[in-house]
Interface confidence: medium
């Protein structure tokens, strides 16, 4: 019979012969012959192959390096790679999440509009009139000025976007 020029799905052509590919999670040890099946072996600990393949080496699982702010989101198996994500308070620097950075701080005069997530940075907003922030923070919102009136006090010093109002006693009318 004519040697095949193409093979079925999950097979590969070698030495004019169709051999079975190794299933996900296994690597190739030896090609099939006229008399023997393809020989495959499971990937070792911390290794994987995620496709039907003829690879002679499994891929190493991704390492989620804590020195880069990374942690394991999903542990790898013999068929899947490890998925890394950022620790709380950090976010990925790229879609592949190869490293993380701390969330950006909002400077005094600005407050946090939206706390960062694992994939997006802090969104800051200027403190509007009546609000202030005197801190550099990735978490704190603008705070409302103190209401002197509710304390039976008067405004001695106006507030700004960076400072609270200063309240003081009301001047007593002299008789």
């Amino acid at each position: 019979p004519e040697p095949p020029t193409a093979c079925r799905e999950k097979q590969y052509l070698i030495n004019s012969q169709c051999c079975s590919l190794c299933q996900p999670g296994q690597k190739l040890v030896s090609d099939c012959t006229e008399f023997t099946e393809t020989e495959c072996l499971p990937c070792g600990e911390s290794e994987f192959l995620d496709t039907w393949n003829r690879e002679t080496h499994c891929h190493q699982h991704k390492y989620c390096d804590p020195n880069l702010g990374l942690r394991v989101q999903q542990k790898g198996t013999s068929e899947t790679d490890t998925i890394c994500t950022c620790e709380e308070g950090w976010h990925c620097t790229s879609e592949a999440c190869e490293s993380c950075v701390l969330h950006r701080s909002c400077s005094p005069g600005f407050g946090v509009k939206q706390i960062a997530t694992g994939v997006s940075d802090t969104i800051c907003e200027p403190c509007p009139v009546g609000f202030f922030s005197n801190v550099s923070s990735a978490f704190e919102k603008c705070h409302p000025w103190t209401s002197c009136e509710t304390k039976d006090l008067v405004v001695q010093q106006a507030g700004t976007n960076k400072t609270d109002v200063v309240c003081g006693p009301q001047d007593r009318l002299r008789a």
């Epitope: 950006r104 005197n134 550099s136 990735a138 704190e140």
Partner: nanobody, 121 residues
């Protein structure tokens, strides 16, 4: 001049507790988020925890979550790290650091000199 001075480290048995302190001076302590980071022998820096300027928000690394608690006393310009259920892998030099505007782990604004925590039986 910004200064951060850690204290409270020492030798403790597995399962034990320690409380670290970080005394801050030279800047408006209450105006900044703060961090704890650590460096195990022969390893790189590892982030441990972040606390917001007011102390309302705290974040922890998975490796210490549920065992460590970060707090601060802005009236005393002091940051704390309460460490419970200590494990051998918690052995490290612990540093407090002022949260910068932007950085990677080797680029904190200001560091303390660190305090060594050794967990061993």
């Amino acid at each position: 001049e910004v200064q951060l001075l850690e204290s409270g480290g020492g030798l403790v048995q597995p399962g034990g507790s320690l409380r670290l302190s970080c005394a801050a001076s030279g800047f408006t302590f209450s105006g900044y988020d703060m961090q704890w980071v650590r460096q195990a022998p022969g390893k790189g820096l590892e982030w441990v925890s972040t606390i917001s300027a007011s102390g309302v928000f705290t974040y922890y690394a998975d490796s210490v979550k549920g065992r460590f608690t970060t707090s601060r006393d802005n009236s005393k310009n002091t940051l704390y790290l309460q460490m419970n259920s200590l494990r051998a892998e918690d052995t490290a030099v612990y540093y407090c650091a002022k949260y910068p505007n932007r950085f990677a782990l080797n680029n904190f604004d200001y560091w303390g000199q660190g305090t060594l925590v050794t967990v061993s039986s």
